[in-house]
Each structure stands twice: as structure tokens, then as C-alpha cells.
């Protein structure tokens, strides 16, 4: 189920879950890319990092990403006894101590360097979709996700009773 | 209470119709991929149907032995999912399970408990 | 479409010992990193239930005597010690490429 909230009794539910255990269950390192086949690209500027959504030239290499997995209980507000079952948490580092954060009030995606136990903003809610993508939903704000705006990452409100365009929250993973 | 009841099964001669309806409960039906899963008598699990999300164009995808047959639908407001079986065949014969998968589509994890389906002259 | 194949078709093990079930697919089911390979216990008139998803992860409620791993195209479910409620037949079930896939299942009874 793409789960996706939209309804109010389900906001509370991803504040409320927790990371079953502080060690990933796996990590996997990968280049980001849109469902369009850009490139998320990460630039060291003024002493900070920016991100990027851009088309690469033929041979330029891809940036990487590691994304570490985690075990998450989801509790139903809904049945009250867990149904929903566990779901799958992931955290983005492109480089050493820096990792993706999602910035609500701004709604911007941004990179960060913090120490572990890592912040809330820096979990995602991983969605696996067709189509060989995934989707990232705040662990903060549910129905919140990572998407692409005007060739930069942006927090996107979601609704799943809307019949929407949803490809510019789609993103592959990939080794190469 | 989480639940999904099947209904609509039923004997049906070879090459007729049959609808099936699961109605769901106790969670937010419209936020859910939904499938449909069968299995013979005395035999294993077969993968049949999934529908996705108004938000995903309610895109579907089906088994190849049944594409082209078995067409799996949703109406939102009324918590159901549907298959509708044409042509029916006897190799058809099995139970019917609706299932539910889990937030983020990792597996399937709420059941119905089944409609029999028997394709039979 | 990428065919599931269980091995043993029935296993019979004494309670309290340990049953190993195993499940190979006919190519990789490794995707994003993880293995999208999960174990079903279905007991007799009933529907079937979640025991590990991604390989290795747990479902909820899933007591502790049960235990997937591997990767690729092998993998192993692990009855730690058998206890009488899990007499039923289990099924490896891939989820990485549409038809989603099942093994041909595994009984398990006492020995």
C-alpha cells in the first residue's frame, strides 16, 4: 500500500513510530536520480552543500549516496493492534557527517551534518514503487515526500485521494 | 477491527462470468494497494491482480494466465475492491483471497479468508 | 517470470529441534540493495501469514524462533524450535518484479 495519509487520524502515526533497533538493517550505496533519468548531484559551496537536479553530460560521473536502512514499527491508529505491520525507514548521506534533511516549515530538503543518534528530519519512510523507483515520505510529516521542483529537491503534499501526476516524487536507485 | 470479507463466489459453468467484492474495514481503504491472490485446491499460492492508488491513476497488473480474463477494480467510496472473472476456466477453480499490502508496499499483510470459485459443468 | 522453487516439499522434525526450509529463485531478487524475498506460514482453512519480509526482517507479532536469510537467488527460513502451533506449510514469495511469485510451499509436521 502506497499509504500515503492525507487523513487526519494518520498524522500522528509516523511521529508516534520508532527505529527498532539504532544500526541499519543494511546499507546499499547508489546514485539518486529522477524518474525523468536526472541526476541528484551534491556541490560543496561556501562551506555548505547544495543540492541539485540536473541532466548530466555523457561521461560525467554519477554522485553517491548511502542510503541506510532501518526497521520501523508502524502503529495503526487505525485497528489499535499493529496491523500495518513494519515498514521500511531510510536515512541519505552523500558524503561523511552530512545527511538529507527535511526542513517542514521551509518545505526544503537540505543537507545537513549532525552527529548519531540522528535527528527525526533525517528519516525517510522508504515507498517501494513500480516501475523500479521509490518515494521518500517525511518521518515527520506523513504525506509528506521528497520530490523535484523547479530543478531542486522540495517537500511535496501528497494526497492519495487526488488524482494526481506523481512522477516528480519517483526516484531510482542505482550502482552505476 | 482490520478486515477484509470476500463474497461472490460460487459454481459458474466453463466460459461463464463471475464477480468477486471484498469489503474492507477498520483502515483507510484509499490509501492502499490491494491484490488479489488464489489457490487452488490442495495446492499453492498463485498471485492473480493488484490495483494501486487514485493517486498512482489506480494503475493495475495482473498474472499472465489470467490478463486479458480477469480485470481487478476499486471504489473508494464504498471500501471494496472487485474481480471481474470472464471466460472462466476449470484450472479457475481455486479460493479467492483479497489482500492487503502493508504501508510502504513491502508484502502482503491483512487477508480475507477466502471465496471458493468452482468452474465446473 | 522468475520461478520460486522450495526444497523440502515436507519436512517432519521433533519438537523443540530445528527445521530449515530452503528457496531458490530462478534469477536475483536483490533490488535497491535489499533482497525482496518474503516467508508466508499458512495453517490449515486459514489464510496466510507475514513471517519475514526483505529476507530477513521480522513481521510484527512473529515470535523470535523464526528467522530468514540470504540473498540473491538463495535463501533460508529458520524454525529455531519447534513448537506444535507451527505445524502448517510455508511459502517463499518473491516481490521484486511483477507476477509476484511464490514457491511451491513446504509442510512442515511432528516428527
Known amino acids: 500500500a502506497f499509504g500515503i495519509s492525507g487523513v487526519q487520524k494518520y498524522t500522528r502515526a509516523l511521529h508516534d513510530s520508532s527505529i527498532t533497533g539504532i544500526s541499519p538493517i543494511t546499507e546499499y550505496l547508489a546514485s539518486l536520480s529522477t524518474y525523468n533519468d536526472q541526476s541528484i548531484t551534491f556541490a560543496l559551496e561556501d562551506e555548505s552543500y547544495e543540492i541539485y537536479v540536473e541532466d548530466l553530460k555523457k561521461d560525467e560521473k554519477k554522485d553517491k549516496v548511502l542510503l541506510s536502512y532501518y526497521e520501523s514499527q508502524h502503529p495503526s491508529n487505525e485497528s489499535g493492534d499493529g496491523v500495518d505491520g513494519k515498514m521500511l525507514m531510510v536515512t541519505l548521506s552523500p558524503t561523511k557527517d552530512f545527511w538529507l534533511h527535511a526542513n517542514n516549515k521551509e518545505h526544503s530538503v537540505e543537507l545537513h551534518k549532525c552527529e548519531k543518534p540522528l535527528p527525526d528530519q533525517a528519516f525517510f519512510v522508504l515507498h517501494n514503487m513500480h516501475s523500479n523507483c521509490v518515494s521518500f515520505e517525511c518521518k515527520t510529516d506523513p504525506g509528506v515526500f521528497i520530490g523535484v521542483k523547479d530543478n531542486h529537491l522540495a517537500l511535496i503534499k501528497v494526497d492519495s485521494s487526488e488524482n494526481l501526476c506523481t512522477e516528480n516524487i519517483l526516484f531510482k536507485l542505482s550502482e552505476t | 477491527e482490520v478486515q477484509l470479507v470476500e463474497s461472490g463466489g460460487g459454481l459458474v459453468q466453463p466460459g461463464g462470468s463471475l464477480r468477486l467484492s471484498c469489503a474492507a474495514s477498520?483502515?483507510?481503504?484509499?490509501?492502499?494497494?490491494m491484490n488479489w491472490v488464489r489457490q487452488a485446491p490442495g495446492k499453492g499460492l498463485e498471485w492473480m491482480a493488484e490495483?494501486?492508488?487514485?493517486?498512482?491513476?489506480?494503475?493495475?497488473h495482473y498474472a499472465e494466465s489470467v490478463k486479458g480474463r480477469f480485470t481487478i477494480s476499486r471504489d473508494d467510496s464504498k471500501n471494496t475492491v472487485y474481480l471481474q472473472m470472464n471466460s472462466l476456466r476449470a484450472e479457475d477453480t481455486a479460493v479467492y483471497y483479497c489482500?492487503?499490502?502493508?504501508?510502504?508496499?513491502?508484502?502482503?499483510?491483512?487477508w480475507g479468508q477466502g471465496t471458493l470459485v468452482t468452474v465446473s459443468s | 517470470d522468475i520461478v520460486m522453487t522450495q526444497s523440502p516439499d515436507s519436512l517432519a522434525v521433533s519438537l523443540g529441534e530445528r527445521a530449515t526450509i530452503n528457496c531458490r529463485a530462478s534469477?536475483?531478487?536483490?533490488?535497491?540493495?535489499?533482497?525482496?524475498l518474503n516467508w508466508y506460514q499458512q495453517k490449515p482453512g486459514q489464510p496466510p501469514k507475514l513471517l519475514i519480509f526483505v529476507a530477513s526482517s521480522q513481521g510484527s507479532g512473529v515470535p523470535d524462533r523464526f528467522s530468514g536469510s540470504g540473498s540473491g537467488t538463495d535463501f533460508t527460513l529458520t524454525i529455531s524450535s519447534l513448537q506444535a502451533e507451527d505445524v502448517a506449510v510455508y511459502y517463499c514469495q518473491q516481490s521484486k518484479d511483477i507476477p509476484y511469485t511464490f514457491g511451491q510451499g513446504t509442510k512442515v509436521e511432528i516428527k
Open positions: 489482500a492487503r499490502r502493508n504501508y510502504g508496499n513491502w508484502y502482503i499483510n491483512v
Open positions: 534469477e536475483s531478487v536483490d533490488k535497491f540493495g535489499m533482497s525482496f
Open positions: 477498520g483502515f483507510t481503504f484509499s490509501n492502499y494497494w
Open positions: 490495483i494501486t492508488l487514485k493517486f498512482n491513476s489506480y494503475s493495475t
